[in-house]
Interface confidence: medium
């Protein structure tokens, strides 16, 4: 099965990918696992999320958004990376709370993108993701009150693309982190539509495999996912067009940043 281009996508651009496999369509493979992965979309020239079945597929599949961008976007590392001191919030500030696998009780802090504040949470002690700070001050300094730099006109600043919690490195290096800049990606806080359009794709609780679409507020697009037939949430549409009609209207057109496509 392959991810199709969005209804609203333009024709295939002239940008040449770094590798031939970056031009392949997303292939979720024949297996039935539901693994959040990323692929490079030749039509949008962006790395986007898709659901991988767990076996076969092709090389246009990455565990993290960052890995996809580094591999498939020409010049990404040279031109799209700048230090956190001069950037907006690092991407890990927008990762969901992840207490990890263990059952310890460690008081930690994370940035909550809904409330725009750093909040306390209980960390189990192992694994998890980098939205995990030992002190409230550290969390605030990195995610709540980052140093802003002026952004070019007609460019939407990167502030909220969803990444996989697997890309974790030592917390002590957080002040030296390089932050990817991804133009043309609307931020979640620029969204004023229906609240369920901000919810992550939820495959539900049953065992069916139904093709559905969910709105990804990070990319401003509707993506396909497999729905198991029961449970889940309201960010679940039978067609991409319905999904776009329901959720795309909530994007704010911001004068200082240009029109969000």
């Amino acid at each position: 099965l392959s991810e199709e281009a969005d209804d609203t996508d333009s024709e295939l651009g002239s940008m040449k990918p770094l590798h031939t496999f970056c031009a392949m369509k997303a292939d979720d493979g024949p297996c039935k696992a539901m693994i959040r992965s990323y692929f490079f979309n030749m039509y949008t020239h962006q790395c986007e999320e898709f659901i991988y079945g767990g076996c076969e597929g092709n090389e246009n599949r990455f565990d993290t958004l960052e890995e996809c961008k580094k591999t498939c976007i020409p010049g990404y590392e040279k031109t799209a990376v700048k230090a956190a001191s001069g950037a907006e919030r690092p991407d890990f500030c927008f990762l969901e709370e992840d207490p990890g696998l263990c059952r310890g009780y460690m008081k930690r802090y994370l940035y909550n993108n809904q409330t725009k504040q750093c909040e306390r949470f209980v960390y189990g002690g192992c694994l998890g993701n980098r939205n995990n700070f030992e002190t409230l001050d550290e969390c605030k300094k990195i995610c709540e009150n980052p140093v802003h730099s002026p952004s070019p006109v007609n460019e939407v600043q990167m502030s909220d693309y969803v990444t996989d919690g697997n890309t974790v490195t030592d917390r002590s290096t957080v002040n030296n982190i390089v932050v990817p800049q991804s133009p043309k990606v609307p931020r979640r806080r620029d969204y004023r539509g229906r609240p369920w359009c901000l919810q992550p794709a939820d495959s539900g609780l049953c065992k069916a495999s139904e093709r559905r679409f969910y709105y990804n507020s990070a990319t401003g697009k509707c993506h396909r996912f497999n729905y198991t037939g029961c449970g889940g949430n309201n960010n679940n549409f039978t067609t991409r067009r319905r999904c776009l009609r329901s959720c795309k209207t909530g994007l704010i057109k911001n004068k200082s940043k240009g029109v969000v496509k």
């Epitope: 696992a33 539901m34 693994i35 992840d98 990890g100 696998l101 263990c102 059952r103 310890g104 460690m106 189990g124 002690g125 192992c126 694994l127 998890g128 993701n129 980098r130 995990n132 996989d164 919690g165 697997n166 974790v168 490195t169 030592d170 917390r171």
Partner: antibody, heavy 117, light 110 residues
């Protein structure tokens, strides 16, 4: 009794793919995080990947990130490890283990993966 | 990231006590009860001997005990027996990894 049985190992050429399975029995599979650990011939143990009980989060060692994919099917009490772009240094016995809060209290017997041309 | 260092080998005679150390390079090891120990006989799967620094799973002999002081965890085996000859691994974790020490080969002399 509580048991884990791995399968799917074998000989594969560099760059090839292999899918390991781990069948669990004797315990409530969907209540436990699960882990893959490997051991190269004559070497020590190396953690490879872990997955939460409901499959919602997955974790990988740097050495396999982007090449290996862990998944599980709780309806079948089975854990999987899809290994792509295999390298000679991936040659090892692969164990699946039950992850009880960061330690591994139940282990399978292991399955040997040999990557060689 | 956390890294764990063990001695390559230790030895002892039957009836003696031996201690295997496991030193962490990260403060995580010193600040949290994160250490477990595994025994592995040649050709066999590892077996959990100690978890949460000093807890013993059911079925493991009380000759095995664990402790921790600062950044160093220790496994002590008292009343050494021939069947204790095996490789022993310490293991811990942090935000990024579940980590094993390099392993210690225990030889029971005589």
């Amino acid at each position: 009794q509580v048991q884990l049985v791995e399968s799917g190992g074998g000989l594969v050429q560099p760059g090839g793919s292999l899918r390991l399975s781990c069948a669990a029995s004797g315990f409530t599979f969907n209540s436990y995080a699960m882990t893959w650990v490997r051991q190269a011939p004559g070497k020590g143990l190396e953690w490879v990947s872990a997955i939460k009980s409901d499959g919602s989060n997955t974790y990988y060692a740097d050495s396999v990130k982007g090449r290996f994919t862990i998944s599980r099917d709780n309806s079948k009490n089975t854990l999987y490890l899809q290994m792509n772009s295999l390298r000679a240094e991936d040659t090892a016995v692969y164990y699946c283990a039950r992850n009880d809060s960061g330690w591994f209290d139940v282990w399978g017997q292991g399955t040997l993966v040999t990557v060689s041309s | 990231d956390i890294a764990l260092t063990q001695p390559a080998s230790v030895s002892g005679s039957p009836g003696q006590s031996i201690t295997i150390s496991c030193t962490g390079t990260s403060s995580d090891l010193g600040g949290f009860n994160t250490v477990s120990w595994y025994q592995q006989h040649p050709g066999k799967a590892p077996k959990l001997m100690i978890y949460s620094v000093s807890s013993r799973p059911s079925g493991v002999s009380n000759r095995f005990s664990g402790s921790k002081s600062g950044n160093t965890a220790s496994l002590t085996i008292s009343g050494l027996q021939a069947e204790d000859e095996a490789d022993y691994y310490c293991q811990s974790y942090d935000l990024n990894n579940l980590v094993f020490g390099g392993g210690t080969k225990l030889t029971v002399l005589g």
